[in-house]
Interface confidence: medium
């Protein structure tokens, strides 16, 4: 969590208090679910448990504030990465229709600084070009790249 600013940490402390309905200093899957649903999201119990498992450093099944900071820092890093990928696509999506050609995808990957072999790019294109028309839907590609 060391890449977070003091302001962000203070903001997350406030958010943590909202999550921590019973004020015991930890968040349970139930409390996390309550807040997420109030934010318009509808995660399953399994998804909630997964989120907690990923950052539950001491394995006690709940999240304390330092673990919460880790979760938030990771979430922000993921968001940056996703935005970076979207931006790379926008450069090539001249008409803004959400698709780019498979050939242009190679340039996108180069723009993102990823050193991929031709073999790897071909495999990514095969997975991203769902209907085989040589066009890549970048919404799907962003999801594939960021494992959402």
């Amino acid at each position: 969590a060391d890449q977070l600013t003091e302001e962000q940490i203070a903001e997350f402390k406030e958010a943590f208090s909202l999550f921590d309905k019973d004020g015991d200093g930890t968040i349970t899957t139930k409390e996390l679910g309550t807040v997420m649903r109030s934010l318009g999201q509808n995660p399953t119990e399994a998804e909630l448990q997964d989120m907690i498992n990923e950052v539950d450093a001491d394995g006690n099944g709940t999240i304390d504030f330092p673990e919460f900071l880790t979760m938030m820092a990771r979430k922000m890093k993921d968001t940056d990465s996703e935005e970076e990928i979207r931006e790379a696509f926008r450069v090539f999506d001249k008409d803004g229709n959400g698709y780019i050609s498979a050939a242009e995808l190679r340039h996108v990957m180069t723009n993102l600084g990823e050193k991929l072999t031709d073999e790897e790019v071909d495999e990514m294109i095969r997975e991203a070009d769902i209907d085989g028309d040589g066009q890549v839907n970048y919404e799907e590609f962003v999801q594939m790249m960021t494992a959402k």
Partner: nanobody
Framework: QVQLQESGGGSVQAGGSLRLSCVAS????????MAWFRQVPGKEREFVGR????????MYADSVKGRFDISRDNAKNTVFLQMSSLKPEDTAVYYC??????????????WGQGTQVTVSS
């Protein structure tokens, strides 16, 4: 959550071979791109090679190209690192890593605990 467990490390003479295995549990293995990294005490973790989630493509660090081979068996939830023509400079702790993506780029989602490989001259 994915748990990764490496095995197959040990001591070997220079020029010898070793085969490392990494078994994954907890999620659908075929959804994950896999990679091997290694680390010498006091140095940064170094990329060794990676394999796509289907096993259709691989990539290797220049230092191991032609000597190391990565493969996977999605039915057995296992990724392998076949190391041959080993050199003393290959001595390190070897880690496997997983990421929910076609190709493992950037930071892995999950890491194994590592297995020690020692190559003596």
């Amino acid at each position: 959550q994915v748990q990764l467990q490496e095995s197959g490390g040990g001591s070997v003479q220079a020029g010898g071979s070793l085969r490392l295995s990494c078994v994954a549990s907890g999620r659908t293995f075929s959804s994950y791109a896999m990679a091997w990294f290694r680390q010498v005490p006091g140095k940064e973790r170094e990329f060794v090679g990676r394999i796509s989630r289907s096993g259709g493509s691989t990539m290797y660090a220049d230092s191991v190209k032609g000597r190391f081979d990565i493969s996977r068996d999605n039915a057995k939830n296992t990724v392998f690192l076949q190391m041959s023509s080993l050199k003393p400079e290959d001595t390190a702790v070897y880690y496997c890593a997983a990421k929910a993506a076609v190709i493992l780029t950037g930071i892995p989602d999950y890491w194994g605990q590592g297995t020690q490989v020692t190559v003596s001259s």
